[in-house]
Interface confidence: medium
């Protein structure tokens, strides 16, 4: 242990306020309270501390919560926040989202930072579930949160959560993450009525198998090519030429310029030419007249 | 059971470019392979960088941002470093690393499996 200096006479630290800002570094430590530094933590994010001084605080911080800090504490601590390492965020047992919120504060518009993710984890963790205030809450400061989690946790994200979800939380999922989400999502939304069910559905539909898209077919919904092209091949592939064109409505013509893109390329090759030619689009590669069409799967799904 | 394969390491002069892979087998469905550690001869393990399922969340440690990238892709189920303007100091084995985990994190504890590592040895 180090030999600790004195306080010099009349610096003693009756309260955390902009005197201490000129202080030394030793003055510091030997003259601050850290018991009066965990009650008046709200203060220092008010003072322009230098950062050696808030490598001081910490330490004194560190020394009074050795098992890690209090959350009365950690609601408080403002930029010494970003002077906490993962290991010492390890030991914090953070329940309130309020605590949470405080300090994803500090770190906005920055990229994630290893603290950040590590408190997001610890506190995640410790609720068991992304319930839809967290949720609302990771996705406000970084909407690429939700498609960072792998399809076995999205598992455990409960369906009234979906209604926290934006499209633009969507935009990095991949198939196997929406195959989670969806009928997470159809379950969220069931209650709504047509329209309003598809601007809510839509950006979840890279999950939908081939019954939900018939239904929408059924249902004027106008699907714009975008939402098509991020639809999963083997759920488009048994639609027909007539369920494509009410699914798309008027968009049914942006068909001609993804026609070399999947799905919409491997499911030209699943129609008739003739069918195709209905559309009017110069669509080509489907099934030539006269040509019988064998689904093997079928086949092997009845021997 | 999950097994972590590093490869990509070597012998590189500073300012070169090294990247680095991670093939992960076994129950990868629960752990995936999502950070990497690193171990210079006489230090702690320190945290490199980490990333979350989908790809898009990362967190760097201070030292490597802006110079390495880490990137995964889960059809192979393999994570990525690639590491650019390499300085003598980045000298160490750099480990794999797979967990459950809720997105990135920085925490070696959250980490149930370790690879062997592969040794990056930067040097004139």
């Known amino acids: 242990e180090v030999e600790k200096t004195a306080c010099p006479s009349g610096k003693k630290a009756r309260e955390i306020d902009e005197s201490l800002i000129f202080y030394k570094k030793w003055e510091l430590e030997a003259c601050v309270d850290a018991a009066l530094l965990a009650t008046q933590m709200d203060r220092v994010n008010a003072i322009p501390f230098t950062y050696e001084q808030l490598d001081v605080l910490k330490h004194k911080l560190d020394e009074l919560y050795p098992q890690g800090y209090p959350e009365s504490v950690i609601q408080h601590l403002g930029y010494l926040f970003l002077k906490m390492s993962p290991e010492d965020i390890r030991k914090w047992n953070v329940t309130s989202l309020e605590t949470l919120k405080a300090l994803l504060e500090v770190n906005k518009g920055h990229e994630m930072s290893p603290q950040v993710a590590t408190l997001i984890d610890r506190f995640v963790k410790g609720r068991g579930q992304l319930d839809k205030d967290t949720l609302d809450t990771l996705t406000a400061f970084y909407p690429g949160y939700l498609c960072s989690l792998s399809p076995e946790e999205l598992s455990s994200v409960p369906p009234s959560s979906i209604w926290a979800v934006r499209p633009q939380d969507l935009d990095t999922c991949d198939p196997r993450q929406l195959d989670v989400l969806y009928p997470k999502a159809r379950l969220a939304f069931q209650n709504m009525n047509g329209s309003e069910y598809f601007v809510k559905i839509q950006s979840f539909l890279g999950g939908a198998p081939t019954e939900d898209l018939k239904a929408l077919s059924q249902q004027n919904v106008s699907m714009d090519l975008a939402t098509f092209m991020k639809l999963r091949t083997d759920a488009v592939l048994p639609l027909t030429v007539a369920e494509v064109q009410k699914l798309l409505g008027p968009h049914v013509e942006g068909l001609k310029a993804e026609e070399r893109h999947r799905p919409v390329r491997d499911w030209i090759l699943r129609q008739r030419q003739d069918d195709l030619d209905t559309l009017g689009l110069g669509l080509q590669g489907g099934i030539p007249n006269g040509y019988l069409v064998l689904d093997l799967s079928m086949q092997e799904a009845l021997s | 059971e999950v097994q972590l394969l590093e490869s990509g390491g070597g012998l590189v002069q500073p300012g070169g470019s090294l990247r680095l892979s991670c093939a992960a087998s076994?129950?990868?469905?629960?752990?995936?392979?999502k950070a990497w550690f690193r171990q210079a001869p006489g230090k702690e393990r320190e945290f490199v960088a980490s990333i979350g399922w989908g790809g898009r969340m990362t967190a760097y440690a201070d030292s490597v941002k802006g110079r390495f990238t880490i990137s995964r892709d889960n059809s192979k189920n393999t994570l990525y470093l690639q590491m650019n303007s390499l300085r003598a100091e980045d000298t160490a084995v750099y480990y794999c690393?797979?967990?459950?985990?809720?997105?990135?994190?920085?925490?070696?504890?959250?980490?149930?499996?370790w690879g062997q590592g592969t040794l990056v040895t930067v040097s004139s």
């Open positions: 690393a797979a967990g459950i985990g809720w997105a990135p994190t920085a925490d070696s504890g959250e980490y149930d499996y």
């Open positions: 076994g129950h990868t469905d629960s752990y995936y392979p």
